[in-house]
């Protein structure tokens, strides 16, 4: 059985506006006040089991009272009223939950979507958050016949029960509403064929040509709601590798189409397509993109051809000589297909000329000492490039004209060459280079330039602190000029060691000192200067630099018949590095003298 | 500069023989192999025969095999070829052609020429 309560507070379901002030009042039972022996003065109100302070309580009349509260912005508050029995013993009447939030704000950019077999989805801004249980309905009608509500679970949007009817305008608006009011969005008015977003397109093919290496072919199937609609595209593709897409001008895909043919592509390059669509008039959305599909374009003829040098060996005997022929894989982007061979076509004048078909980038030949010319073209499934054509003339033939002003840098963690081109017009620049050794021979690596560079940068992986010695040789009609070298650093370190000092003549009062050089392996940079420190056991120690070209340095001034301790330092462009220390004693008389 | 001069060609009969030269100068005739071609009436140029620079190793078509005989005497920078057991279908324009390497190769591929006049071979009953 339940107990009767003593009183009850009224309103009973509060719902307060936030930052606006609310009172709420306890009415006790006749009943009651006789059996307690109180009256209204007698209660106590709390808010969270926390006592509301006197000010905010008036007492009414012997059986009522209210509390009053200010700027209300806790969203929810157990107000509960009690009474002091016996005037110690709390007791409690009656309680209620009152809630605080705002009425809702009238819904706003109401849009609605037709996903290609789905029903309608609309969905709107509900404005600022209400803190309250807010319903909201979609509504929608035809100028003659309303649809069923659809209530919202979200708040932001709702699925509508019932198909779309395409090509006959539907009114559609939101209505919210909780315990604080009720508001109406701006209703939209709308033919539901131009909100549809289609599925996206499917099948999706790539085909290349044999005729085109520029071109590929698109087809695929779309649907628009079973070919009610006709749809315009959007193609998009990207290189195998690459991040960013492409754009195929959209005015190229207006018309409806399930086919499309892709131009200006590169040969033999894996390019990956998506398409998707929209009603042609463009109202609507745009579908969600396709699966991705990929194709490669066919090969090409390779548009150049390898770079080209060669090498002699010394001769052996007076009159042959081995050549070796050296070239450069060509990158695919020049190579247009995978390279099957290379063709080497050796002539002379007034000679049979003989051609090699050689797979690997190399070919070695003996050959008199004649002139000679040599031509080389790379060959894929399509065809064959252009031929690069060497001179390689009599090995009595003194090389004229060579490059000037050569340098080398490092920048941006490259090693950069430049020089000033000979006086004769160049066919093109070779430029070679190995790490400088005395522990391992001089591998080189080599490039080949155009007739107008005079600047690049080393196109190898280089080592730091390893010395690299470069040469650039112009190349001419008549065959290579004169070659030009340098050594050079990508970046400089401290010498791995220091030199080793050693006398070489002692006196009574000088002493000369030796060294060698440190060998290239453990320079780490160009020896730029040298510092000698020497001392006595008590002295204070002296410093003196020396250039880096001596390899001896006399010491003066010294005193006679005393233990010298001596210590070498190398330095580079980034630092110094001490060799072991040296000891030696001057003699206490000089040669011939007596004491 | 190369200079090629052929003589020895004639009017002979079928079965009949012949012995070909080549007069070599403007260059070290025996740093080079050297080749034999012909032209027939009508036709493209058909390789002959060659040999290498020393002379010691020797090459043939094989409508020639065994009926011509190639050889060289590089003290004289003379290049000869023996024709024997002549047929009607050896009635052509034949040419002595520098390689451009001590060695002939039958693997490699060669473009052939005729820089020098030739001598015309005849062979008729």
């Known amino acids: 059985q339940l107990l009767e309560p003593c009183g009850y507070i009224y309103p009973e379901f509060p719902v307060v506006q936030r930052g606006s002030n609310f009172t709420a009042i306890c009415v006790l039972k006749e009943a009651c006040l006789q059996h307690y022996y109180v009256n209204a003065s007698y209660i106590v109100w709390k808010t969270n089991h926390a006592a509301v302070p006197r000010e905010q309580v008036t007492v009414i009349n012997r059986t009522t009272s209210s509390v009053t509260f200010t700027d209300v912005v806790l969203p929810s508050v157990q107000l509960t009223c009690n009474i002091l029995s016996f005037g110690q013993i709390e007791q409690n009447v009656y309680g209620v939950t009152m809630l605080s939030g705002f009425p809702p704000d009238k819904p706003t950019n109401l849009t609605c979507i037709v996903n290609e077999g789905k029903n309608m989805l609309c969905q709107w801004d509900p404005g600022r958050e209400t803190y309250l249980e807010t319903n909201y309905t979609l509504k929608s009608e035809w100028a003659t016949e309303k649809f069923p509500d659809c209530q919202s679970k979200h708040g932001t949007s709702c699925m509508v029960s019932y198909m779309p009817t395409y090509y006959v305008n539907i009114e559609v608006w939101v209505e919210a509403e909780n315990a604080l009011g009720k508001v109406s969005s701006e209703s939209i008015n709308f033919d539901p064929v131009d909100k549809v977003k289609p599925t996206p397109p499917y099948n999706l093919s790539v085909t290349n040509s044999e005729e085109l290496s520029s071109i590929l072919k698109l087809s695929w199937v779309s649907s628009g709601l079973g070919g009610l609609l006709d749809l315009k595209s959007d193609i998009q593709y990207r290189t195998k590798d690459a991040s960013t897409w492409i754009q195929v001008p959209l005015e190229d895909t207006m018309s409806p189409r399930t086919s499309f043919t892709v131009q200006d592509l590169k040969p033999f390059t894996e390019y990956v397509f998506r398409i998707r669509s929209i009603k042609d008039s463009g109202k609507g959305y745009w579908s969600d993109w396709s699966e991705e599909a990929s194709g490669t374009t066919y090969e090409d003829r390779p548009s150049r051809p390898p770079s080209f040098w060669y090498k002699t060996n010394p001769s052996h005997g007076q009159e042959y000589r081995s050549v070796r022929l050296i070239w450069k894989a060509l990158p695919l982007s020049e190579a247009n297909g995978k390279i099957l061979d290379y063709e080497v076509i050796l002539t002379q004048s007034k000679s049979v000329s003989q051609t090699y078909t050689v797979t690997g980038t190399e070919l070695t030949v003996n050959l008199t000492n004649d002139r000679y010319v040599a031509s080389l073209a790379a060959r894929n499934k399509v065809g064959k490039s252009a031929a690069a054509v060497l001179t390689i003339p009599s090995p009595h033939v003194t090389a004229a004209y060579s490059v000037v002003n050569l340098k080398a840098f490092p920048k941006d963690n490259l090693l950069w060459v430049e020089w000033t081109p000979p006086p004769k017009p160049v066919s093109k620049y070779i430029l070679e280079w190995c790490v400088l050794s005395e522990n391992a021979p001089c591998v080189e690596d080599w490039q080949q330039e155009d007739a107008t560079v005079n600047r690049t940068h080393l196109r190898g992986r280089l080592l730091e602190s390893k010395c690299y010695q470069i040469t650039v040789t112009p190349v001419f009609a008549t065959g290579p000029g004169g070659s030009e070298s340098l050594k050079a650093y990508l970046k400089q370190a401290a010498p791995a060691r220091g030199p080793t000092v050693r006398t070489k003549k002692v006196g009574k009062n000088e002493a000369v000192l030796a060294w060698d050089q440190i060998p290239v392996d453990d320079q780490n940079g160009f020896i730029r200067n040298y510092s000698i420190s020497y001392r006595t056991s008590v002295g204070k120690e002296m410093v003196v630099h020396v250039d880096s070209s001596h390899t001896e340095y006399t010491l003066s001034s010294l005193s006679s018949d005393t233990l010298y301790m001596v210590r070498m330092a190398a330095y580079t462009d980034e630092g110094g590095k001490d060799g072991p220390e040296f000891t030696f004693t001057t003699p206490k008389f000089a040669q011939g003298e007596i004491e | 500069q190369v200079q090629l001069q052929e003589s020895g060609g004639g009017l002979v009969q079928p079965g009949g023989s012949l012995r070909l030269s080549c007069a070599a100068s403007?260059?070290?005739?025996?740093?080079?192999?050297m080749s034999w071609v012909r032209q027939a009436p009508g036709k493209g140029l058909e390789w002959v025969s060659a040999?290498?620079?020393?002379?010691?190793?020797?090459y043939y078509a094989d409508s020639v095999k065994g009926r011509f005989t190639i050889s060289r005497d590089n003290a004289k920078n003379t290049l000869y070829l023996q024709l024997n057991s002549l047929k009607t279908e050896d009635t052509a324009m034949y040419c002595c052609?520098?390689?451009?390497?001590?060695?002939?190769?039958?693997?490699?591929?060669?473009?052939?020429?005729?820089w020098g006049q030739g001598t015309q071979v005849t062979v008729s009953s």
């Open positions: 052609a520098k390689h451009i390497t001590g060695d002939y190769d039958p693997s490699l591929r060669y473009e052939y020429n005729c």
């Open positions: 403007g260059f070290t005739f025996s740093s080079y192999a």
């Open positions: 040999i290498n620079s020393g002379g010691g190793s020797t």
